[in-house]
Interface confidence: low
């Protein structure tokens, strides 16, 4: 998953500014890049530490700029290193100046095991002294002086990976800052060979792509993608995926590749030479220009590209028909994803031709680990691969990358997965109140372990005893009434909180023990509440009779209608009244009891009643007489409530008369508000008065009522009241 | 570091309005409870006011005065005190709710005064 | 509404003494009361809560004690920045979230 390149610029050293950049494309590492000098490969190089900088123009880029005054602190071996998961992947470059009186061939010469190779120096200039060649630092090998040829060459019959290495030449009187290097890479494997016994078949690696020993994958060439390295990148691009962009006028002259091994240095395609600064010849394309085109039908051929296939035509050479390979793009893959930690399925899909198939969609872990489909479909014009990550935890938060590499191209997309820890209320929750059958719970919701914003929040609850199932309620306030429990029950209660998106559910937080009271008895029977005097009433009931032996009594609450004034009263059991005293003349209190043992018991309905007054009560009010005939008349009236009215009297006599002659209607009680008398006399005027009596007298009325009955003929009359003051 | 750093606070008239604002910082602003507690010159703590996920609740004395409300986006906790009158008068803190009070700001003086 | 009441309301004592301060609620309140000290001119800051677990960074020589209606806040050896006001605060019935009217703790 780590795309390492290592850019030597212009690797033969003049009085020019040079430079070494490793980048890191298309990957985000967790340890920074490295760039050292190979001591392995060269030992008695210069000592000088480097001076490592971003490279401003990428993000994941390192450089080290040596100014031409330097030239001569240059000369030796180098490497890029970067991490993931632990491992290190490390790519080696030379530097040598470009006066040495050797050159190599190339920079770097990869072989198979057991092939037949040889190391070629160029000698450029001449001198009266014997050649020397060393590997790593140290002799091997010596030609007189007489005998050096214009190629000076090492000749190894049957390569084995113990030879590889750095190679030097020299003339015997000079010294690192005058050699040429060339470094051998030997293949773990027999040509087209891999695997831990070499015993697997390589890919066929296109456009000189090599086969990686130990993963059996193509490392392509600068310019190539691809699983096979069959599709040429854009212009002037290079990496695994041709992200990355060769920002010179010239493309990528100049630029000398270094990819991890097996692979070595190269230059981009469509340049050769040491330095990468000379054109491919025409008919030639590729990495160092050694690639010939032979293409078909009269194709194009492009030194960047190799053929460039009519429409309906592809392969390396156009030699082949069919459908134009589309490189894979990966869709419907958002730049951020927020999971909960636990079970998560990642999906990647892609489209492309061919469409990518299973082995060829991968998934990698921000730690460089890489994940393979689990699951697989296509349909016409996508590929779905299913991933599964049996527990995604915080620390896997990070960049991921759908990555898809078909012979048509690669693709990566990196996205952003941020795993959140599920919430999980740190304290138990609280009850508040409970009763017989119900508990009033504060949840205490907060504060919480895990992230939130909580979606939703559910309260647990169950039976202690009983092997019931967990029941729950969805929540929405902090202050919850659970109902219908059963009473002398010990309950356990706990909270689950729920954050959004799937799997949101946290595990339930502390739990809370908590036992129902016993069912309360039913209140007292045939409550009555009377006013006893002034300043007491009389509440009584029937005895009570309770089913257990449990000791009970009567609690009587009773609080002022008029004033805020309650009092609780605690009555033995045996009693059956209480007389509620230290009260208000005049004035309403309501009163309601319950039995209580341990258990407290159910209120009755409140009762209502008046203390006897200290005053006089006020004369009735909207006194009416109506519905007159010639013998009858109704009258009616109303009375101010809190006076302890006990009867009202209603005194009559025809105008005129003695008052010893007046008639006395007594109405004994007080709720009637009209009365009709009867028997008088047609056409006479009658002088009506109205009282009301209470326990401390009668009213005194203002003025009289008068009443005229009609002629025994004529139909009822209302008299709105005329009045005579007496 | 926990930090909650109250602003709003002023000199006003009886009957007029100010709104508190808290800044909160160094821990995760919306999955607490915020609340505000004042303190009136010499006198003890009173809880004002305080907003729990959905839920707010209020001191009988501000109940229908006072407004408490948060900004998860940009971790600011409000009051909006409407109908100011003198007994309001005292230094405003606001405080990370847990049923008690973990941590608070500064505080910020609001005086009622004709 | 549930009242706290605190004693004493002013404690003189020297640095190295025993303090005492105690709150008592007018209800059953559980376990649920936290302590407050406040130094003059600044912020409360919390020191109990639970009624007995110490907040972060509160040192040792504070402790706290009881359940039901009464409760206890103990500084078993006081230094100079100890003296300051403490209060006490329930959470077991709100709204309202109600305080004690103070302890304040000065050097005899």
């Known amino acids: 998953a780590m795309d390492l390149i290592l850019i030597n610029s212009l690797p033969l050293v003049s009085d020019a500014e040079t430079s070494l950049t490793c980048i890191a494309s298309g990957w985000r590492p967790h340890e920074p890049i490295t760039i050292g000098r190979d001591f392995e490969a060269l030992m008695n190089q210069h000592q000088d530490p480097l001076e490592v900088t971003q490279d401003v123009t990428r993000e994941w880029a390192k450089k080290v700029v040596w100014k031409r005054e330097k030239a001569s602190k240059i000369n030796g071996a180098y490497f890029c290193e970067g991490r993931v998961r632990g491992e290190a992947i490390r790519i080696r470059t030379m530097k040598m100046r470009q006066q040495a009186s050797f050159l190599p061939a190339t920079l770097t010469m990869t072989v198979d095991k057991g092939d037949n190779v040889n190391i070629s120096f160029k000698k450029v200039l001449i001198k009266e002294e014997d050649a020397v060649i060393y590997k790593n630092g140290s002799f091997i090998h010596s030609v007189p002086r007489h005998e050096v040829p214009d190629i000076l060459e090492v000749h190894l019959p049957h390569a084995q990976p113990q030879d590889a290495g750095v190679y030097s030449a020299r003339y015997i009187g000079g010294n690192l800052f005058t050699s040429a290097f060339t470094r051998l890479i030997v293949r773990r494997c027999e040509a087209q060979k891999w695997g831990p016994e070499c015993n697997h078949l390589c890919t066929a690696c296109m456009n000189n792509g090599v086969c990686h020993e130990d993963t059996g994958e193509c490392i392509c060439p600068p310019g190539f993608m691809g699983r096979t390295c069959e599709k040429a990148c854009e212009l002037h691009t290079f990496g695994r995926t041709c992200k990355e962009r060769c920002s010179g006028q010239e493309g990528c002259k100049s630029y000398v590749f270094c990819l991890p091994d097996p692979y070595g240095c190269s230059c981009a395609t469509g340049w050769k030479g040491l330095q990468c600064n000379e054109a491919c010849h025409p008919g030639f394309y590729g990495p160092d220009c050694k690639l010939r085109c032979s293409c078909n039908n009269g194709e194009m051929c492009d030194r960047f590209q190799g053929c460039l296939c009519s429409p309906g035509w592809q392969g390396l050479q156009c030699e082949r028909e069919g459908i134009q390979r589309m490189t894979p793009k990966i869709v419907d893959l958002p730049d951020h994803i927020e999971v909960n930690s636990g079970k998560f399925n990642p999906i990647c899909k892609a489209s492309g031709w061919p469409l990518p198939t299973n082995e060829e969609m991968t998934l990698v872990k921000p730690d460089g680990t890489v994940l393979h489909p689990k699951d697989f479909n296509h349909t016409d014009h996508f590929s779905v691969a299913i991933f599964t990550i049996h527990r995604i935890l915080p620390p896997d938060s990070g960049v991921w990358v759908c990555s898809v590499n078909t012979v048509a191209g690669m693709v990566e997309k990196p996205f952003n997965i941020s795993v959140k820890v599920l919430p999980k209320p740190l304290n138990a929750p609280n009850v508040i109140d409970t009763g017989h059958n119900f508990a009033v719970i504060n949840i205490s919701s907060e504060p919480y372990f895990g992230d939130g914003p909580i979606k939703s929040k559910k309260l647990l609850y169950k039976p202690v005893n009983h092997y019931e199932a967990w029941q729950h309620i969805q929540v929405t306030n902090e202050i919850v009434t659970l109902n219908y429990l059963e009473p002398r029950t010990e309950y356990e209660l706990c909270v689950q909180l729920v954050r959004r998106g799937e799997g949101g559910e946290g595990h339930p937080g502390p739990v809370r023990r908590f036992t129902t009271a016993s069912i309360g008895l039913p209140p007292p029977r045939g409550l009555n509440l009377l006013p006893k005097s002034q300043t007491t009433l009389n509440l009584t009931w029937q005895p009570i009779f309770p089913s257990s032996e449990d000791d009970f009594y009567v609690e009587v609450e009773r609080r002022s209608v008029q004033k805020s004034d309650q009092q609780n009263i605690k009555v033995p059991g045996n009693l059956t009244s209480v007389l509620l005293n230290n009260l208000h003349p005049r004035e309403q209190y309501v009163v309601r009891a319950r039995v209580n043992t341990k258990a407290q018991g159910e209120w009755s309905e409140d009762l209502t009643a008046w203390t006897l007054s200290d005053i006089l009560p006020p004369q009735p009010e909207n006194i009416k007489i109506s519905n007159i005939t010639h013998s009858s008349a109704v009258i009616s009236w109303t009375i101010l409530d809190g006076y302890s009215i006990s009867s009202i009297t209603i005194r009559y006599k025809v105008q005129g008369k003695n008052e010893d002659q007046h008639v006395d209607v007594k109405i004994k009680n007080a709720t009637i508000t009209q009365y009709q008398l009867k028997g008088l006399e047609p056409e006479t005027a009658y002088q009506v008065d109205i009282f009301a009596e209470n326990n401390i007298g009668s009213s005194n009325p203002a003025f009289s009522h008068e009443l005229v009955t009609l002629p025994e003929s004529q139909a009822p009359a209302d008299l709105g009241g005329g009045k005579m003051l007496l | 570091d926990v930090q909650l750093v109250e602003s709003g606070g002023g000199v006003v008239r009886p009957g007029e309005s100010l709104t508190l604002s808290c800044v909160a910082s160094g821990f995760t602003f919306s999955s607490y409870g915020m609340s505000w507690v004042r303190q009136a010159p010499g006198e003890g703590l009173e809880w004002v006011s305080a907003?729990?996920?959905?839920?707010?609740f209020y001191a009988d004395s501000v109940k229908g005065r006072f407004t408490i409300s948060r900004d998860n986006s940009k971790n600011i906790l409000y009051l909006q005190m409407n109908s100011l009158r003198a007994e309001d008068t005292a230094i405003y803190y606001c405080?990370?709710?847990?049923?008690?009070?973990?941590?608070w700001g500064l505080g910020t003086l609001v005086t009622v005064s004709s | 509404e549930i009242v706290l009441t605190q004693s004493p309301g002013t404690l003189s004592l020297s640095p190295g003494e025993r303090a005492t301060l105690t709150c008592r609620a007018s209800q059953h309140v559980n376990t649920h009361v936290a302590w407050y000290q406040q130094r003059p001119g600044q912020a409360p800051r919390l020191i109990i809560y639970d009624a007995t677990n110490r907040a972060n960074d509160v040192p040792d020589r504070f402790s706290g004690s009881g359940s039901g209606t009464d409760f206890t806040l103990t500084i078993s050896s006081l230094e100079p920045e100890d003296f300051a006001i403490y209060y006490c605060q329930q959470y077991n019935n709100w709204p309202p979230l109600t305080f004690g009217g103070g302890t304040k703790v000065e050097i005899k």
């Open positions: 907003i729990n996920g959905g839920s707010t």
């Open positions: 405080a990370n709710w847990n049923s008690f009070f973990d941590y």
